[in-house]
Structures are given as C-alpha cells and as structure tokens.
Interface confidence: low
C-alpha cells in the first residue's frame, strides 16, 4: 500500500531508536571510512526531518524516496572525494543508479585499524558516562567493517552488548562476568557476517532464482510439515527481507522481518511445531529464533518421490506448464524427506533433474530417457559423504590447529596467488569446520558441513574479487554458486605457478611474538608456513612439518630466554639457514 | 492448460444460500491454490476466499467472514464456494481462480487460470 511519505511510514512503523539505529547502520555501511560523529550528525539530521514528515506527511520533501533522502544526506559529506576517491562520482548520478553506485563501492576488506578491546573498567566506565553513545558506537564500528551485516540482526546483537554490559558492569568480578560474553558475540558476529554475505552473493551474482532456490530447499528442509503454498509465501517474504537488506534499504528490510516474523507465529500450527518458545520472545528475539530453529520433524506417511517425478506419465507436461514450478516442487518434497543432505547438495540434485527433464522431454521417448534419473544423483550424495568423512577423521587423528595447517598447505598449493593473509583467514576458517560439524552425528554432518564450507569460501570469493589473482579462483567463484565447494576441492596444486623469490625478511621474528595471545601466536606460524609453501610449493608434508615443529621449538626456547631478543635474532638466522637445506631453499 | 468451469450461481432471495463449484482439467489439480473471486455490475473484481493445495490454509475477505465456507475436494477435481445469509451487495458475477505459485492469496494478479464466471443474483 502506497505511503504519502516513506519515510514517516518507516519511522511510525519502526519507532525512533530502531530508526536511528538502522539509518546509522545503513550510513556506516555505505561510508565506512567517516568519523563517528561526522555519521551520528547526519543521523540526527534524518531523524529530525523524519518527525516533521511524521507531523505533517504533505511537508516539503516528505514525499521523496528514502534512497533519494539518503543518497543526498550522504552527498552533503564534504570530505566524499579526498576520502573516498570515485565514489564521490556517484553524486552525479540520479536516482537508482546513485544508490547502485554506492552499493559497488562497498569494501569487504575496508582499510581499518584492528579493533583493540580496552580494558574492562574502562568499558564499563564508557558505557555508565554515556548508555547511548557507547551503544551506537558498537552498531558502528560493526557496521563499516561489515558493509553487509543483516541490520535487523546487528540490532539483536546490541541488544546482547548491551545486557552483557547492564550485568557484568555490576558483577563482583567483572572481567570474568564479561570477556566470555563478548568472545561469544564477536564470533557469532562474524559468523552471521559471512552467512550473510552469501546470501548478498547469491542475489547480486546469481539472480533472485538462486536465492529463491536455496530458500525453498532450506526452508522445506526445516518445515517438513508445511505445505508447498506455505513454503512458497515464505521464500517470496524472506526473498524480499534479503533483497532489501543486501540493496541497503535497511528499514525497508527491517520491517517486512518483523511482518514476517509476526506472519509466522500467526500461522506456526501450519508451518512448524517447534516454533512455540520462538514466538513467545520479544520481536528482536524472535526473528533470531526463527532464524535458527531446529528442523520440525518429518511427516511419517511421505510417499516415494519416484511417484510424482519419474514414474507419472505427467512429468512433461507438468514440466512444460510450469518449469520453476515444477522444479520447485520437486526441491521442496526432496529436500523435506532429507535434513540430512546439505542444502547445496539438494540444489545441485535439483540441477541434475532439470537438466535431464530439459533433454528427455524433447527426446521420442521421454520416460524411457528420465527413467533412470534417480540413478544419476547416487554419485552426487557419496562425493561430500566421502569428503567429510576423511576430513572428520582427518580432524580427530590431527585436531584443530594442525588441520588448519593441513588445509593452509592444501590451499596455498591450489591458490597460491592468492594473498597470504586471505590464504590464512580463509584456512583458518575452513579449518573451523572439524571442531563445529564433526562432532554431530552422521546424518547431521553434511548440511552442517558442507553449507558452512559455502559460507567460508565465498569468504574468499568475494575478497578475491576485489584484487583478482587467479584465474583458478575466479573460475570456480563464477561458474556455479552451488559447486564452488566441489570446484576447489577437485583443484590440484598449480604447476604453472613460479614460486616467490625466498626473502629472509619474512621468516624474521621478535620477542613481541611471546606477548600474543596462543590465536594471534598461532596466526604469526601460519602466515610463515604460507610464505614457506609459497617459496617451495613441491615441498613434502613431512618437510614442512620439520620446519614448523623447529620453528616451535625456536619460539619456545625464545620466549623462555633472559635476552628474549637477542635469542630471537642469533637463533632465527640458524633456523632459516636449516630450514633452507631442510628445503632444498 | 488449466480449464475451469463455474457452477451453481442462480437467483435467491435475501438471507438463501447457494453453493457454487468449479472443476479444473487440464492440470495437477492439488498442485495449484485454489480462488474465488466476483464482480459487480460497474466496480472492479474483489477477493473472496481462497485455499491452499492440501486445505490447510483458507482465507476470507472481511465482508464474506462467518458467512461463506471455502472447500475443495482433490479426488474430484474441484472448489466450493458454500454462501449462507446472502445479502443484495453479494450480487455479482462470481469467478473461479487457479494459482501455481502464489504469496499473496488475495491478489488477483498472482492467479494463473480464470474461469469464465456464474452470476449470483440476491434479490426479494
């Protein structure tokens, strides 16, 4: 339903602090290099003109799109050219293509300081002096480093700091109360970062018909008990949050999640039986909990899929009337007959059926050609089978760190164009999947396994794409969303690559090493095992494992030392010159 | 395609009920949300009721709630519209619908098949 005035419509909808917070948000997504108070003075002045629209919807200006309103309030940033170079031509432009403008210059790997945690009383200190500042700077500095961070969830995890805070500040020992709170919510931050990201990559890259795609298989994966029209209003709603929120229009996104949210709690006896402890949250909540419950369990009188889909005289003709149909009928009763598959794998089985209805509906005779479609998708499921389970066993005879190591060495020899610290970041993470997914049972390990790989690699998909090395990458990053996992998996290491010229530099360490925390100590070694396979790409495991386990010792020894520093020098000249030989450097 | 033939409409008097059906061919009947629609003489077609493939869902507009029931029956093919307590402004011409794919159960634009309409007269 049309509005007089967007804007007012938002603000009336969303209330001022959700507004404030959310036009914030947008802000520090779009210029991630402004000062703070530079993006809380234009937020005030959006929130102003805002309560004069509420007042009065026919009052001058009102009537405006609120990417115009934006877009301009953005443009009035006097320093647009000298901080952000060409973006500052998107001011040229009118109205979509200004905003579009402003969406391709969003930086994944913006040029920001590391955020350095300060000490507890300090924060508790910051936030008592001033609740409200020390809140919208959280939502900022979130914000612009995560240019595609789901608002309406950003204002769930502030709401966590801010209890985290209301509690621990007050607590007998306040760093205990508090550090494990916000080691909590920066990983789970970063998580819902990535998971996010994708699904922007798969809407900017793929097309709205991928991301409905991945939502029916998923949400029939969780929803069994939902009928089809059910599943289907909820991929069109969530199709549109996701659009919303990955084209900046953040309020927009933030309302529809709550009409969605408040649809599905409306109407949980026909979509779900788990969704009861969900619904009875505040609204910030309850959108989270939906979000991650647990799949319903499955109707127990399914019948065989080979009814309706090879076996029905009709499979043509109902191919014909109606393809994405069809196919999304046919994603929808094979995904809610399997929590077990990833939903890649689902899609990818998808993709093999309609490829094959594709040519045996023009053949002469099309069943005789589809009859054995079925057969076709056995290959499919044991290839991730037998990947994880290596891996899972790879993981449990290794454990993290050195399954980070194996990975590292494994990608560095695929990619090694690719830079080291992504190459690191990358493999770190890819790693994580041992210690979240290998612990589950068997028919859980796949979609955990194999959708969170999705999340990783488009990690280094899209931090690729802004310095484009390897072409290996770009390919598997472009071709297909849904075999971007099989695609690396299938790269073997890169015989056209020259390897780097050895630089003793980079295998120079100091006595600052001993003062990291074990991740950070951790991060230094396999930044040098990169740079090590970089230097010798033919190198053997069991080279390269001498290497480290010599470089260990040397750091241990080291950092035990009276002279730290002295160590570090005479020591490191000895280990680079045997792990030179060790080498063949 | 999907054909869809209306029934039952006639002339009743205030307060009478009628009941029409539409039968489908042509398609997978239970695949498709199924909708009522009318029109009366000089106002644009309005929303009814409607009901999801397996009718789990229906859904009513305000001014026929209470009074008119929504039902279908897979094996044969076909929807009902029960219309009890008819009143003069039900008057028009009422229209089946066939949707594939469908979010918004109300809006016409989202169905696919129309049939050609039965005319309900309520009249003293």
């Known amino acids: 339903d049309a509005h007089k005035s967007e804007v007012a419509h938002r603000f009336k909808d969303l209330g001022e602090e959700n507004f404030k917070a959310l036009v914030l948000i947008a802000f520090a997504q779009y210029l991630q290099q402004c000062p703070f108070e530079d993006h809380v003075k234009l937020v005030n002045e959006v929130t102003e003109f805002a309560k004069t629209c509420v007042a009065d919807e026919s009052a001058e200006n009102c009537d405006k799109s609120l990417h115009t309103l934006f877009g301009d309030k953005l443009c009035t940033v006097a320093t647009l050219r000298e901080t952000y170079g060409e973006m500052a031509d998107c001011c040229a432009k009118q109205e979509p293509e200004r905003n579009e403008c402003f969406l391709q210059h969003k930086d994944d790997n913006p040029n920001l300081p590391r955020l350095v945690r300060p000490e507890v009383d300090v924060m508790c200190t910051a936030f008592h002096d001033n609740e409200e500042t020390f809140l919208k700077k959280y939502l900022y500095e979130i914000a612009r480093r995560h240019p595609y961070f789901y608002a309406p969830e950003l204002l769930f995890f502030a709401k966590r700091y801010k209890a985290a805070f209301t509690e621990c500040c007050q607590a007998a020992d306040k760093a205990a109360c508090l550090l494990p709170k916000l080691d909590e919510l920066r990983d789970e931050g970063k998580a819902s970062s990535a998971k996010q990201r994708l699904k922007c990559a798969s809407l900017q890259k793929f097309g709205e018909r991928a991301f409905k795609a991945w939502a029916v298989a998923r949400l029939s994966q969780r929803f069994p008990k939902a009928e089809f029209a059910e599943v289907s209003k909820l991929v069109t709603d969530l199709t549109k949050v996701h659009t919303e929120c990955c084209h900046g229009d953040l309020l927009e996104c933030a309302d529809d999640r709550a009409d969605l949210a408040k649809y599905i709690c409306e109407n949980q006896d026909s979509i779900s039986s788990k969704l009861k402890e969900c619904c009875e949250k505040p609204l910030l909540e309850k959108s989270h909990c939906i979000a991650e419950v647990e799949n319903d369990e499955m109707p127990a009188d399914l019948p065989s899929l080979a009814a309706d889909f090879v076996e029905s005289k009709d499979v043509c003709k109902n191919y014909a009337e109606a393809k994405d149909v069809f196919l999304g009928m046919f994603l929808y009763e094979y995904a809610r007959r399997h929590p077990d598959y990833s939903v890649v794998l689902l899609l990818r089985l998808a993709k093999t059926y309609e490829t094959t209805l594709e040519k045996c509906c023009a053949a002469a005779d099309p069943h005789e050609c589809y009859a054995k479609v079925f057969d076709e998708f056995k290959p499919l499921v044991e290839e991730p089978q037998n990947l994880i389970k290596q891996n899972c066993e790879l993981f449990e005879q290794l454990g993290e760190y050195k399954f980070q190591n194996a990975l590292l060495v494994r990608y560095t020899k695929k990619v090694p164009q690719v830079s080291t610290p992504t190459l690191v970041e990358v493999s770190r993470n890819l790693g994580k999947v041992g210690s979240k997914c290998c612990k589950h049972p068997e028919a859980k390990r796949m979609p955990c396994a194999e959708d969170y790989l999705s999340v990783v690699l488009n990690q280094l998909c899209v931090l690729h794409e802004k310095t484009p090395v390897s072409d290996r990458v770009t390919k598997c990053c472009t071709e297909s969303l849904v075999n971007r996992r099989p695609c690396f998996s299938a790269l073997e290491v890169d015989e056209t690559y020259v390897p780097k010229e050895f630089n003793a530099e980079t295998f120079t360490f100091h006595a600052d090493i001993c003062t990291l925390s074990e991740k950070e100590r951790q991060i230094k070694k396999q930044t040098a095992l990169v740079e090590l396979v970089k230097h010798k790409p033919k190198a053997t495991k069991e080279q390269l494992k001498a290497v480290m386990d010599d470089f260990a010792a040397f750091v241990e020894k080291c950092c035990k030392a009276d002279d730290k520093e002295t160590c570090f020098a005479e020591e490191g000249k000895k280990l680079v010159a045997a792990s030179q030989a060790a080498l063949g450097l | 395609e999907v054909q869809l033939v209306e029934s039952g409409g006639g002339v009743v008097q205030p307060g009478g009920s009628l009941r029409l059906s539409c039968a489908a061919s042509?398609?997978?009947?239970?695949?498709?949300?199924m909708g009522w629609f009318r029109q009366a003489p000089g106002k644009e077609r309005e929303f009814v009721a409607a009901i999801s493939q397996n009718s789990i869902h229906t859904y009513y507009a305000n001014s026929v709630k209470g009074r008119f029931t929504i039902s279908r029956d897979n094996s044969k093919n076909t929807v009902y519209l029960q219309m009890n307590s008819l009143r003069p402004e039900d008057t028009a011409l009422y229209y089946c619908?066939?949707?594939?794919?469908?979010?918004?159960?109300?809006?016409?634009?989202?169905?696919?098949?129309w049939g050609q309409g039965t005319l309900v007269t309520v009249s003293s």
């Open positions: 042509g398609g997978t009947f239970s695949t498709y949300v």
């Open positions: 619908a066939a949707s594939r794919f469908t979010s918004w159960y109300t809006a016409d634009y989202e169905y696919d098949y």
